[in-house]
């Protein structure tokens, strides 16, 4: 019946040498893609020159395979029934799953100038860093290849730099070769109620990012969740990527290759200005750019990123308040194609399905000593690139998932 | 209130160096740079360059380089200008100046400025 | 590097008069100059910043104008006080460069 359902459940989804979650969770059987769309732009000299908009045209999928690393110094605690890990980082680029190759050029914003102009806000390191931006011969935007922009390359403005500074830059530099954590999460052993919650990252509860429970790790990594999960609960999960703890809410029953998964999703509601959602309010941690905290849509990392003006948002600013986007000609948000959501199976919890959306955007502001930003008249929060994260349960687990678990109960 | 506390007056031999020092009070000393300006009757006020201890950024104008030397030491709130195989023409009233910080005033406050004269 | 010239070298002028001086410099610097007062045995005194910003505590007969390359400095109602050397900077590009100076004498 449906207590040994209930018992043979709980010792399965346990992490613990030996349980199927385990096998699963160590090193995970379903394959995961990334498919990166980078923003191309069209008029970078008439940005340049007359602070016209951006016009942006997306140019994907360019698609990695990512996460087919088992988990490192996966270590178990008995006496807090928590187990310790690190998820190492690597991408193998999948010609085939793609529009091209690594080697595609792109016109985008010079990530250095953008990013130094930042930084170092006082003039007089500015009107250095001018003279460095002109010896280089760099400019407000650049053309890098798609490997260069992903993974990094050595950048000319920053190699003149006569302090140590890194002069290696890329979106996601570095990336291969490392590893996300240390994670360390509840086995469940003890309260299965709590099975994959994460205790602490890089050895501690809170991030320093954020004020007030904005800074709490909430929840699990979203691979997995607690089991016998109902429509009405609220799913917490914590993103590295993201810097932030976030939350899905039930959207729909939907049927995954015959089995029954629920469809959660990242309600816009999470992507709103404290004025629509005071629970908001301490993920607003800058005044002028939120213009009063009253944008949406978009989320100030840079202290995550060590200063960089990191924004992340929705792909194509879906969620977004206008003034976001007013910047930018050549968008189309689709909540279809750019929400994120995750299909659970809710008996064991686990994440059957998910499509991870997010968009990477740089902030460059005017700047009357940095001679290729001067004639700009506004802000801009410039996307770079919207990705979209993928995994769906193998056709053979699939199957065994059908005859273990819901066949079982059916 | 913002102060600059320059060095004293130094009388030095040809070919020697010298060194001056530019003791900053009342602000943060990594939030500024510090510039040091030369000056004297045939050309005037001439930059020289500048420092900024909060991100270790130092510049030079082309025309002093290999001449002056700047630094800064955090720890006493002091910047230094070395100057090097001295000359006739390397006599000057040297100043040590500070912005306003991010409202475009260059040299806002000056230090009372350190007399090199050299001569054997 | 972009060169500034001053002019006039001097200036001699009666007390309540208007006093002009001007600075044009080799490169376009946008409205990035700026205005400074020395006194005998002084270091010199920043009056107005770029953006023709007069400094706070600075008296408002001074005032500057300018755009681009051409820059003037006006006085506009001369006092004994007002004695002094005037030096012109731009401060648009490295190396930052200064004026020859003006000296302003009463008549």
């Known amino acids: 019946g449906d207590m040994l359902i209930q018992k043979t459940i709980k010792k399965e989804v346990v992490l613990e040498e030996g349980t199927i979650a385990f096998k699963n969770w160590v090193k995970t059987g379903t394959e995961i893609y990334r498919q990166f769309w980078i923003f191309d732009v069209q008029n970078p000299q008439e940005v340049m020159m007359n602070s016209s908009n951006i016009q942006v045209k997306q140019r994907g999928p360019y698609t990695y395979r990512v996460r087919f690393l088992a988990k490192e110094n996966i270590t178990q605690d008995p006496k807090d029934n928590t187990v310790s890990f690190l998820q190492p980082n690597g991408a193998i680029f999948e010609p085939s799953l793609s529009v091209g190759t690594e080697a595609d050029n792109f016109t985008v914003l010079n990530l250095a100038v953008a990013a130094a102009s930042h930084i170092y806000p006082n003039p007089f390191v500015q009107v250095v860093l001018n003279s460095l931006i002109n010896k280089s011969k760099s400019s407000m935007f650049q053309v890098r290849t798609l490997r260069e922009l992903l993974w990094g390359y050595t950048d000319p403005f920053l190699s003149l730099v006569p302090y140590p500074v890194s002069t290696r830059v890329g979106m996601f530099y570095p990336y291969n070769n490392t590893a996300d954590g240390v994670y360390k999460v509840f086995n469940g052993k003890d309260s299965i109620s709590k099975v994959a919650i994460i205790d602490t990252y890089k050895g501690k509860r809170n991030l320093s990012y954020w004020e007030s429970y904005c800074d709490m790790i909430n929840g699990t990594d979203a691979a997995s969740f607690p089991p016998f999960v109902e429509k009405s609960q609220v799913l917490q999960f914590f993103s590295s990527d993201i810097c932030r703890s976030i939350y899905a809410v039930f959207e729909s029953d939907v049927n995954l290759k015959g089995i029954p998964v629920y469809r959660f999703v990242l309600p816009s509601k999470a992507f709103a200005s404290p004025v629509q959602n005071p629970d908001n309010h301490c993920f607003c941690t800058e005044k002028i750019i939120s213009k009063n905290c009253t944008s949406y849509g978009v989320l100030d990392i840079s202290k995550c990123k060590e200063g960089k003006p990191v924004y992340i948002s929705l792909p194509h600013f879906l969620y977004a308040s206008p003034d976001v986007s007013e910047t930018i000609d050549g968008l189309n948000p689709n909540e279809e194609e750019h929400r994120t959501y995750l299909d659970i199976e809710p008996i064991t919890g686990f994440t059957l399905q998910f499509a991870k959306r997010l968009q990477v955007n740089l902030l460059v502001k005017p700047s009357n000593k940095i001679q290729v930003l001067k004639r700009l008249k506004r802000n801009y929060i410039v996307p770079i690139l919207w990705l979209n994260e993928t995994g769906t349960i193998g056709d053979e687990k699939a199957k065994m998932f059908r005859s273990q678990v819901t066949g079982k109960i059916n | 209130q913002v102060q600059m506390k320059e060095s004293g007056a130094e009388l030095v031999r040809p070919g020697a160096s010298v060194k001056l020092s530019c003791k900053a009070l009342?602000?943060?000393?990594?939030?500024?740079?510090i510039q040091w300006v030369k000056q004297t009757p045939v050309h005037g006020l001439e930059w020289i360059g500048g420092?900024?201890?909060?991100?270790?950024?130092?510049v030079y104008n082309q025309k002093f380089k290999g001449k002056a030397t700047l630094t800064a030491d955090k720890s006493s709130s002091t910047a230094y200008m070395e100057l090097s195989s001295l000359t006739s023409e390397d006599s000057a009233v040297y100043y040590c100046?500070?912005?306003?910080?991010?409202?475009?005033?260059?040299?806002?406050?000056w230090g009372q400025g350190s007399l090199v004269t050299v001569s054997a | 590097e972009t060169t500034v010239t001053q002019s006039p070298a001097s200036l001699s002028m009666a007390i309540g008069e208007k006093v002009t001086i001007r600075c044009i410099t080799s490169t376009d610097i946008d409205d990035d100059m700026n205005w400074y007062q020395q006194k005998p045995g002084e270091p010199p005194k920043l009056l107005i910043s770029e953006g023709n910003t007069l400094r706070p505590g600075v008296p408002s007969r001074f005032s500057s104008s300018g755009y681009g390359t051409d820059f003037v400095f006006t006085i506009e109602n001369m006092l004994s006080e007002d004695v002094a050397d005037y030096y012109c900077?731009?401060?648009?590009?490295?190396?930052?460069?200064f004026g020859s100076g003006t000296k302003l004498e009463i008549k």
């Open positions: 900077l731009q401060s648009d590009n490295l190396p930052f460069t």
């Open positions: 100046t500070r912005g306003g910080g991010y409202d475009g005033a260059w040299f806002a406050y």
């Open positions: 009342g602000y943060t000393f990594t939030d500024y740079e």
């Open positions: 420092i900024h201890p909060g991100s270790s950024g130092i």
